[in-house]
Amino acid sequence: KSSNEATNITPKHNMKAFLDELKAENIKKFLYNFTQIPHLAGTEQNFQLAKQIQSQWKEFGLDSVELAHYDVLLSYPNKTHPNYISIINEDGNEIFNTSLFEPPPPGYENVSDIVPPFSAFSPQGMPEGDLVYVNYARTEDFFKLERDMKINCSGKIVIARYGKVFRGNKVKNAQLAGAKGVILYSDPADYFAPGVKSYPDGWNLPGGGVQRGNILNLNGAGDPLTPGYPANEYAYRRGIAEAVGLPSIPVHPIGYYDAQKLLEKMGGSAPPDSSWRGSLKVPYNVGPGFTGNFSTQKVKMHIHSTNEVTRIYNVIGTLRGAVEPDRYVILGGHRDSWVFGGIDPQSGAAVVHEIVRSFGTLKKEGWRPRRTILFASWDAEEFGLLGSTEWAEENSRLLQERGVAYINADSSIEGNYTLRVDCTPLMYSLVHNLTKELKSPDEGFEGKSLYESWTKKSPSPEFSGMPRISKLGSGNDFEVFFQRLGIASGRARYTKNWETNKFSGYPLYHSVYETYELVEKFYDPMFKYHLTVAQVRGGMVFELANSIVLPFDCRDYAVVLRKYADKIYSISMKHPQEMKTYSVSFDSLFSAVKNFTEIASKFSERLQDFDKSNPIVLRMMNDQLMFLERAFIDPLGLPDRPFYRHVIYAPSSHNKYAGESFPGIYDALFDIESKVDPSKAWGEVKRQIYVAAFTVQAAAETLSEVA
């Protein structure tokens, strides 16, 4: 049988039939269904939703749908002993207390089991002391405080505004600075777009709204008690003292009304510059401590949350491939939410649900994809990407041999301005070609392609006439697949206009106000942006699973490798004297990139010309494409981050959300001028150049003619 016969419908009609079956009204209906009650990881409500999704995916026509459960470390507030922060006077009396909960949104007043705002995995504690305002608590903010302003955070409680970087990095930085507690808050400068009403009248954050979130520094480990291995029935668990990535100091989040009360009394040093000022009507003094009249008052934290080993459930659906059933294309997104999950994750889960329904409809008509498609509804993403990571750990041997691609499907929207895509360079051409075939949903672009509106609104900084595609970082469920296993990965969603909206993420992120109504009233009333995201995600999965030759272009990797090599070289060249002193050369890396470029070019020529009717040669060429991403994996991992094994990309050591290129070299060079032993530090730079050059050369050789 030819591959076309096996899939029963002509290739062009396949994709069109799949896309035509996707309906905005269904996504809307699914979103409503998924957002009526909270679905916190580890709760009965989320288990029930898992079973509902399992049942519906079976009805939609998947071959099998199973629950995969794991017992992982989660964190919850104490129901009888709430977390809060006080201002105390010299007698220890509490003269101000922060809110214990967010005021519920209209229509949700009687909903039970709304978890109050908390920082997941915070240890218990009741530290008291002077406050220091640390801006965003980024690495550079602590450099400014400690090196320029000579402010010592040791023994202080720090208050940091959310935004710019992952909250776990903020906590890690505060710990390293010696702080004994961290208060996180949402400043209106970052979470309130001027001119828009706060919820329920608009999509802005009200003063009582608070962002929940985990504060782990897992570096890809998954369950903190079982790093590297699945948290199954016979797992050996570490003691809590040896758990991976747990914070050592109490942490708690608050809204800007409460933050105003803490910040308005701040004394000490003035903010170093305007970048340290938010939009509250307070001076943004750094401290330490309160001003004049209030100098005897202190801040006290009361944190009583507990860490508990709890059962979680992934839903794994399979649509078996007709021709290459042992090749897996995975579409996965999480199901667990902090509260209602109106955007995160259910705007993504509703899209996955509709994609499954469309594939199921085609399958019921006799069609099958060429390759196997796996669909996943992950649990406990909000607690550190736990569900996806445990499943990948359990199935790592299968995945590393059979995994073609992973497409992530968390929140479908974070705005309604234009498309946003982060993916491996192997998928650039796939994304470009697909978006040229899809209609833009944007006003003013009627009858135009998605590619056109995307390129106009979000142009590539390097290539004119092309859209921006970003590097993969982390903070979502693709992490284990891409950063640990080296499976080509991508993600797509609709986003805001980053030029005009400087706030971080979307204002109501991880708050109780992330409801169905938020989406239906303010972000996407017609669900046209959700439909477009479904078409992009689903279209990518379709092409990856069904195209005869995998839709990967290795030449695009060559282009970015040269760009990344140029970038890291220019960073190193800020230290010309040391490079000379310690004989640091990037020649090996540039040579390897040159070789990769030439070999990739020749491989692409062969890809055009080979006999596609020969199944052995076809499989061989496809395997070279599939395993190219794998070839960038270093089995030893990055220094001190064994589960980040991709040599070309890793989450930034300073911001988990951001991707860094040549991370081993980058980290070796970072702040190198402050290292106590320059010879050792530059030796590590040289070692990392060696590792990178070897890896690029080795990857290039996987694309050479096999004999």
Epitope: P188, A189, P194, G195, L205, Y256, P271, R277, K281
Partner: antibody, heavy 124, light 107 residues
Framework: QVQLVQSGGGLVQPGGSLRLSCAAS????????MSWVRQAPGKGLEWVAN????????YYVDSVKGRFTISRDNAKNSLYLQMNSLRAEDTAVYYC?????????????????WGQGTMVTVSS | DIVMTQSPSSVSASVGDRVTITCRAS??????LAWYQQKPGKAPKLLIY???SLQSGVPSRFSGSGSGTDFTLTISSLQPEDFATYYC?????????FGPGTKVDIK
Amino acid sequence: QVQLVQSGGGLVQPGGSLRLSCAASGFTFSSYWMSWVRQAPGKGLEWVANIKQDGSEKYYVDSVKGRFTISRDNAKNSLYLQMNSLRAEDTAVYYCARVWDYYYDSSGDAFDIWGQGTMVTVSS
Amino acid sequence: DIVMTQSPSSVSASVGDRVTITCRASQAISSWLAWYQQKPGKAPKLLIYAASSLQSGVPSRFSGSGSGTDFTLTISSLQPEDFATYYCQQAYSFPVTFGPGTKVDIK
């Protein structure tokens, strides 16, 4: 359409009183803070007073405290400024203005809708 | 009270010119700043809020920037209807205060 129509200006002797009115239409008056802003002849703008949506909070510039009273009647969609013990330096065009809560704190952000202005002259 | 100063106090310009007006606050006001245009005998009109956000219906040739204490209003290409007096206003703390104004007239 959204508008503010003013009345009540005129000539008054020093020490005298005057009441300015401002009628709102085209928007939900009770949802907005309201203000009075004045402009002396040939001079710049000076904020005079603010009043909260329900009238529970009022703020004044120091120079009018104890002499001027801002008030509102939400049922009539009207804003008032009662001016007592008037002085020559109170001579100005008085504008009523809607406070636009473009940011999280609605107590005094920007003035997006203005009345046409009414002249108050304090002279003997 | 927060004192607002503007410079220049007046500027003569021609149609098509780029005009920049600066406003300085006596203390940091974050982005709590608005800009107004006033023509003789008329009420002021809101142009810019939150230091850089363009009010609905205002032409895009007007733009605002700045944060903290220093702010700028820019008219990228002056049009005949733009000849007027421009005021900045802080809303960081009571009392709300305005700058003294900058008059833009025909060269």
